[in-house]
């Protein structure tokens, strides 16, 4: 229903704490360079204003849209043009164009230093001094680095952070309590970020229908006992929630997500038998839990899919008269039978089915034409299954770091024009799929691997879009979202690439590498590996292994040496010479 004051309505629905958190996230995602203090001041002003509207909905400006109110706040920031350049031009526009303009200026790769975690003692001190400010900093720092982070989920991670600090700061050994727990939250939050970015990409590039199809497949896998009408309702609601968050309407998004969680918990009987434990939790935990709830048990008596979608006499009529309903039903029926498939694969199968009907239905004998469509799915299913087997075997053989290196070589050969930092980031993220998915039971591997890879490749596409350098990458990124992963997998060595000149300084290292944390050391070595491949794109795996082993040995020797600097300066050039010879 319409409310006299939108801001008062959202403040009342969400409560002050969540309201403030969401406004802070919104501002941090729009203006990614502003300091926490600048944003905190704006948030306080907006909150105070919301309270006046709660007290009197007819008060001045209370009837304005949230976009107008928030946009006016952002546009009133001093030195906007100096700090943000052409983003300031957005302020010359009227709503809704102004908000669209802000969205277009969100930067997926802002030039901000990595979010460094303070040491345990310092963290606990500032947390105890002012938990609210501490959590505000967390929201601000994450949101500005991840401008599409799913806002209500970020509140959930902040809550997790809070609980971990509350528990660990009371321990004697704070460090060993905090580190693994916070690392766990960080890892989950980073995965959540790339997954949500993929959803926003789907929405932005292909519209609501594409996202809704994704949601139908995902929900049908999770809730195979829910009927099509129920799945459609959930998918429609979920699409609205995500559209709002992707569009910067974070208060509406969080409010509607809470409503959706409430609806699901009130209708468990028609949705799933697995929801009760989630529904017993408080709001943020409940919504999070529902988003990753285990699949319900599949009904035992599901008829063969062919009955309604191949053998039925009305297949073509049903398709032509209501594609959305007919193909939606196909996606629902196929997905509920295949929790072992990735959503990407299910969408490819639905696309293949649609294309087959579009080709066959106008023919003289349509059933003869589309009769083999289900058999034609086989190669589409086998391809990702083989991908999972091959990659998980390789991961088990090499371990995470070795697997990342194998992927780095492969992707540098596919797209050597891409910047080394981007290739290293992508390979490290793609390589984590092993740890994340290959240890799972067989029937969970494929959905885990492919949907995770798709989300990581979406980030590769977003970064490449900013500065397009590789025709290979452009080709894969400009197709449909569900075809990206197979497209990247199918890429081979880029024959058009002219190898990079060998520069000794690229492979020159100093003793400071010895004191770096293990992760940073790995990144340095992987940077060198990518550069080697750019120099010799057709180097064999054996040649690269020889060089990298030599390099690891060199680091080990020099980092153990009494005079590290001398070791690096004398042995370094020898290493470079050996590398050149090995790759000659």
């Amino acid at each position: 229903e319409a409310h006299k004051s939108e801001i008062a309505h959202r403040y009342n629905d969400l409560g002050e704490q969540h309201f403030k958190g969401l406004v802070l996230i919104a501002f941090s995602q729009y203006l990614q360079k502003c300091s926490y203090d600048e944003h905190a001041k704006l948030v306080q002003e907006v909150t105070d204003f919301a309270k006046t509207c709660v007290a009197d909905e007819s008060a001045a400006n209370c009837d304005k849209s949230l976009h107008t109110l928030f946009g006016d706040k952002l546009c009133a920031i001093p030195n906007l043009r100096e700090n943000y350049g052409e983003l300031a031009d957005c302020c010359t526009k009227q709503e809704p164009e102004r908000n669209e303009c802000f969205l277009q200026h969100k930067d997926d790769n802002p030039s901000l230093p990595p979010f460094e975690r303070p040491e345990a003692e310092a963290m606990c001190t500032s947390f105890k001094e002012n938990p609210t400010t501490f959590m505000g900093h967390y929201l601000h720092e994450v949101a500005r680095r991840h401008p599409y982070f799913y806002a209500p989920e970020l509140l959930y991670y902040a809550e997790q952070y809070n609980e971990i600090l509350t528990q660990c700061c009371a321990e004697a050994d704070k460090e060993s309590c905090l580190t693994p727990k916070l690392d766990g939250v960080k890892e989950k939050a980073l995965v959540s970020s790339v997954r949500q970015r993929m959803k926003c990409s789907s929405m932005q590039k292909f519209g609501e229908r594409a996202f809704k199809a994704w949601a139908v497949a995902r929900l049908s896998q999770t809730f195979p006992n829910a009927d099509f009408a129920e799945i459609t309702k959930l998918a429609t609601d979920l699409t609205k929630v995500n559209k709002e968050c992707c569009h910067g309407d974070l208060l509406e998004c969080a409010d509607d997500r809470a409503e959706l969680a409430k609806y699901m918990c009130e209708n468990q009987a028609t949705i799933s038998s697995k929801l009760q434990t989630c529904c017993d939790k408080p709001l943020l935990k409940k919504a999070h839990c529902l988003s990753e709830v285990e699949h319900d048990t599949m009904p035992a008596d599901l008829p063969a899919i062919a009955a309604d979608f191949v053998e039925d006499q009305e297949v073509c009529k049903n398709y032509a008269e209501a594609k959305d309903v007919f193909l939606g039903t196909f996606l629902y029926e196929y997905s509920r039978r295949h929790p072992d498939y990735s959503v990407s694969l299910l969408l490819r199968l639905a696309k293949k089915y649609e294309a087959t009907l579009e080709k066959c239905c106008a023919e003289a004998n349509p059933p003869a034409c589309y009769g083999t469509v289900l058999a034609e799915f086989q190669p589409l299913v086998e391809e990702p299954k083989n991908l999972v087997k091959t990659n998980c075997d390789l991961y088990e053989k090499l371990g995470e770091y070795g697997f990342q290196n194998a992927i780095l070589v492969r992707y540098t050969q596919k797209a050597p024009q891409v910047s080394t930092p981007t290739l290293v980031e992508a390979a490290r993220n793609l390589g984590r799929v092993g740890t994340k998915c290959c240890t799972l039971p067989e029937d969970q591997r494929l959905p885990c691997v492919e949907d995770y890879l798709s989300a990581i490749l979406n980030r590769v596409c977003l970064l490449h879009e900013k500065t397009p350098v590789s025709e290979h990458v452009t080709k894969c990124c400009s197709g449909s979202l569900v075809e990206r992963r197979p497209c990247f997998s199918a890429l081979t060595v880029d024959e058009t690439y002219v190898p990079k000149e060998f520069k000794a300084e690229t492979f020159t290292f100093h003793s400071d590498i010895c004191t770096l944390p293990e992760k940073e050391k790995q990144i340095k070595k992987q940077t060198a590996l990518a550069e080697l491949v750019k120099h010799k794109p057709k180097a064999t795996a054996e040649q690269l292994k020889t060089v990298m082993d030599d390099f690891a040995q060199f680091l080990d020797t020099c980092c153990k040496a009494a005079d590290k600097d001398t070791c690096f300066s004398t042995e370094g050039p020898n290493l470079v010479t050996r590398c050149k010879d090995a790759l000659a």
Epitope: A320, E321, A322, V325, E358, A362, A364
Partner: antibody
Framework: EVQLLESGGGLVQPGGSLRLSCAVS????????INWVRQAPGKCLEWIGI???????FYATWAKGRFTISRDNSKNTVYLQMNSLRAEDTAVYYC???????????????WGQGTLVTVSS | DIQMTQSPSSVSASVGDRVTITCQSS???????LSWYQQKPGKAPKLLIY???KLTSGVPSRFSGSGSGTDFTLTISSLQPEDFATYYC???????????FGCGTKVEIK
């Protein structure tokens, strides 16, 4: 050379009926979907309906009930039967083939030259 | 109700000019089922572009189509004398019965 040729147009009184023909030469009609599209003088193109190779028909919502499409593959001809004609049905009527490989998409690659239907008393 | 809005309704241009015609659909077309036709006076329409951006064989490469969902564009990069005509977009939707054409854009000599 593939050709579509409409015939049967002319002057008809309001409330009257008319049957248009679309004779196809150069291809075997039995493999193709044929559409009827009309264009009132100086106005927009308006899709009327389609008949698939199998004989299945679909119509624009406004055309259901008054217009019927049929085909006679032995004569390589498609027909448009129009009943209860009104002044606003005055238009040039075209038949057009759907691009092979599509069934429901608005891609029509071969067109007739059109036949004029005038509904007037 | 399906709406297919073409703009502008007419445009005056000279040989060599770049001409852009837009077509807005409500709701969005199905799966990029969007075509562009060229029609000259007294003649039948001619299919130029299908699937929003694919050129029909024999159509000069100065014609190009782009867009997705609800917003589509036909561009003639360098107008030739034979390009003066009326251009129509056609859209396909979830139901075949909703197949709709725009009302045309007349490209006239300036």
């Amino acid at each position: 050379e593939v050709q579509l040729l409409e015939s049967g147009g002319g002057l008809v009184q309001p409330g009257g009926s008319l049957r248009l023909s679309c004779a196809v030469s150069g291809i075997d009609l039995s493999n193709y979907a044929i559409n009827w599209v009309r264009q009132a003088p100086g106005k927009c193109l308006e899709w009327i309906g389609i008949i698939w190779a199998s004989g299945t028909t679909f119509y624009a919502t406004w055309a259901k009930g008054r217009f019927t499409i049929s085909r006679d593959n032995s004569k390589n001809t498609v027909y448009l039967q129009m009943n209860s004609l009104r002044a606003e049905d005055t238009a040039v009527y075209y038949c057009a083939r759907t691009v092979p490989g599509y069934s429901t998409a608005p891609y029509f690659d071969l067109w007739g030259q059109g036949t004029l239907v005038t509904v007037s008393s | 109700d399906i709406q297919m809005t073409q703009s502008p309704s007419s445009v005056s241009a000279s040989v060599g000019d770049r001409v852009t015609i837009t077509c807005q659909s409500s709701p969005s077309v199905w799966s990029n089922f969007l075509s562009w036709y060229q029609q000259k006076p007294g003649k039948a329409p001619k299919l130029l572009i299908y699937e929003a951006s694919k050129l029909t064989s024999g159509v000069p490469s100065r014609f190009s189509g782009s867009g997705s969902g609800t917003d589509f564009t036909l561009t003639i990069s360098s107008l030739q004398p034979e390009d003066f005509a009326t251009y129509y977009c056609g859209g396909g939707y979830s139901s075949i019965s909703d197949t709709t054409f725009g009302c045309g854009t007349k490209v006239e000599i300036k």
